[in-house]
């Protein structure tokens, strides 16, 4: 066909953005391209091509009006992870094409076991108490929080410090005796541990 | 169409090696595991291990380790399965099977049958 | 390895009876737990994946209950074409039940 004066090349106008999303929930990939004619969109991922409702009418992947990539909901298996991965979108007519940023899609995991449970302990009163756990596997990194006879435990408390996994007391009072569960939580939700009792002896 | 189409029927003789291939079409290979399977004559389903398209890395059950070999070759988006040192017992049909991102095997080959005879 | 029990082996029944399958792993696997049908002469099909959920296409008479090491699945009311084997797969370690042959009573 003969170039008209008014068409012109693909540009990419809107990029796609990194994204973190839940197993299971909805996402979407932005992008937008000018060009004249107007130009057809494509997502690859790791350099191949993203298949979606127009190659197969089942797939979970669509491509929308605008161009941008919908997933009606993120597919991640304990081994197959079709969804994660780098993505770019290129935007092609008769005069050529554009290539958008890079974007990551990671998937936000939390599992359900705990690494390390932790354990009863019995002290004195006055003596330091030291709990310990290790949460589940997850991604983002889950943060350490821990509950007391079911209600979240004061950290303002000077003599309580939460540190990566540990929990420690560093004198213990009679009213710190209790049942302790550690939780971990990232944007997945939260998991919590196996309870562990904390003693605390008169001396 | 998500599809896997296996290679031909084979009659090999103990002791010889067969090589089943699998081809991948209407996904994107790299990104689900690939896993075969087999099934000897009225017997039930017996998994042989897998491959992760996107490197290469393989894990296979004990008893095929050291006689299986699976690989892959991405630009045509075909796996294989090498199966040595064959005896009369491995005589069956070996499927290609995709795991979905749901832990399951929910595309699978047609099946190729396997002969081991002497 | 996890090793997966299915019973019954075989089981006779009528159009229109409701069929129960169980399947049994040797340690708690969650709700890691697949079930397919298969045909004489064809490839396994996907019925249900994670114990309960139902697999795009499977019609609604199928459905998976169960989590940890006891699962179920029941076909509510048997159709003609439901006749066939049926196999139980844990998606930890991915080895089969032994499968359950359904026939014509």
């Known amino acids: 066909s003969r170039l008209r004066q008014e068409d012109f090349p693909p540009r990419i106008v809107e990029h796609p953005s990194d994204l973190i999303v839940s197993k299971g929930e909805p996402a979407t990939l932005n992008c937008k391209a000018e060009g004249r004619p107007t130009p057809t969109i494509e997502w690859y991922k790791g350099g191949e091509r993203v298949e979606t409702d127009k190659d197969d009418p089942r797939s979970h992947r669509m491509l929308l009006p605008s161009g941008s990539l919908f997933f009606l909901r993120i597919v991640h298996g304990r081994r197959s992870k079709p969804d994660e991965g780098v993505y770019v979108c290129v935007a092609r007519n008769y005069l050529g094409e554009a290539v958008s940023h890079n974007a990551s899609l990671e998937v936000a995991i939390l599992r359900d076991d705990f690494r390390q449970n932790p354990s009863d302990v019995m002290v004195a009163v006055g003596e330091p108490a030291v709990m310990e756990c290790q949460p589940p596997r997850g991604h983002p990194e889950p943060t350490i929080s821990w509950k007391k006879d079911g209600s979240p435990l004061d950290d303002k408390d000077e003599r309580i410090t939460i540190r990566g996994g540990k929990l420690m007391i560093t004198y213990t009072r009679k009213s710190d005796a209790g049942k302790y569960v550690c939780v971990g939580t990232n944007m997945v939700g939260e998991r919590e541990s196996e309870v562990a009792e904390l003693t605390v002896l008169e001396r | 169409e998500v599809q896997l189409v296996q290679s031909g029927a084979e009659v090999k003789k103990p002791g010889a090696s067969v090589k089943v291939s699998c081809k991948a079409s209407?996904?994107?290979?790299?990104?689900?595991?690939m896993h075969w399977v087999r099934q000897a004559p009225g017997q039930g389903l017996e998994w042989m291990g897998w491959?992760?398209?996107?490197?290469?890395?393989?894990e296979f059950p004990q008893k095929f380790q050291g006689r299986v070999t699976m690989t892959r070759d991405t630009s045509i988006t075909t796996a294989y399965m090498e199966l040595s040192r064959l005896r009369s017992d491995d005589t069956a049909v070996y499927y290609c099977?995709?795991?979905?991102?749901?832990?399951?095997?929910?595309?699978w080959g047609q099946g190729t049958m396997v002969t081991v005879s002497s | 390895d996890i090793q997966m029990t299915q019973s019954p082996s075989s089981l006779s029944a009528s159009v229109g009876d409701r069929v129960t399958i169980t399947c049994r792993a040797s340690?708690?696997?969650?709700?890691?737990l697949n079930w397919y049908q298969q045909k004489p002469g064809k490839a396994p099909k996907l019925l249900i994946y994670?114990?309960?959920s139902l697999q795009s296409g499977v019609p609604s008479r199928f459905s998976g209950s169960g989590s940890g090491t006891d699962f179920t699945l029941t076909i509510s009311s048997l159709q003609p074409e439901d006749f066939a084997t049926y196999y139980c797969?844990?998606?930890?370690?991915?080895?089969f039940g032994g499968g359950t042959k359904v026939e014509i009573k």
């Open positions: 099977a995709r795991e979905s991102g749901d832990d399951a095997f929910d595309i």
């Open positions: 209407g996904y994107t290979f790299t990104g689900y595991y």
């Open positions: 491959i992760n398209p996107k490197n290469g890395d393989t």
């Open positions: 340690q708690s696997i969650s709700s890691y």
């Open positions: 994670a114990a309960s």
């Open positions: 797969q844990q998606s930890v370690g991915l080895f």
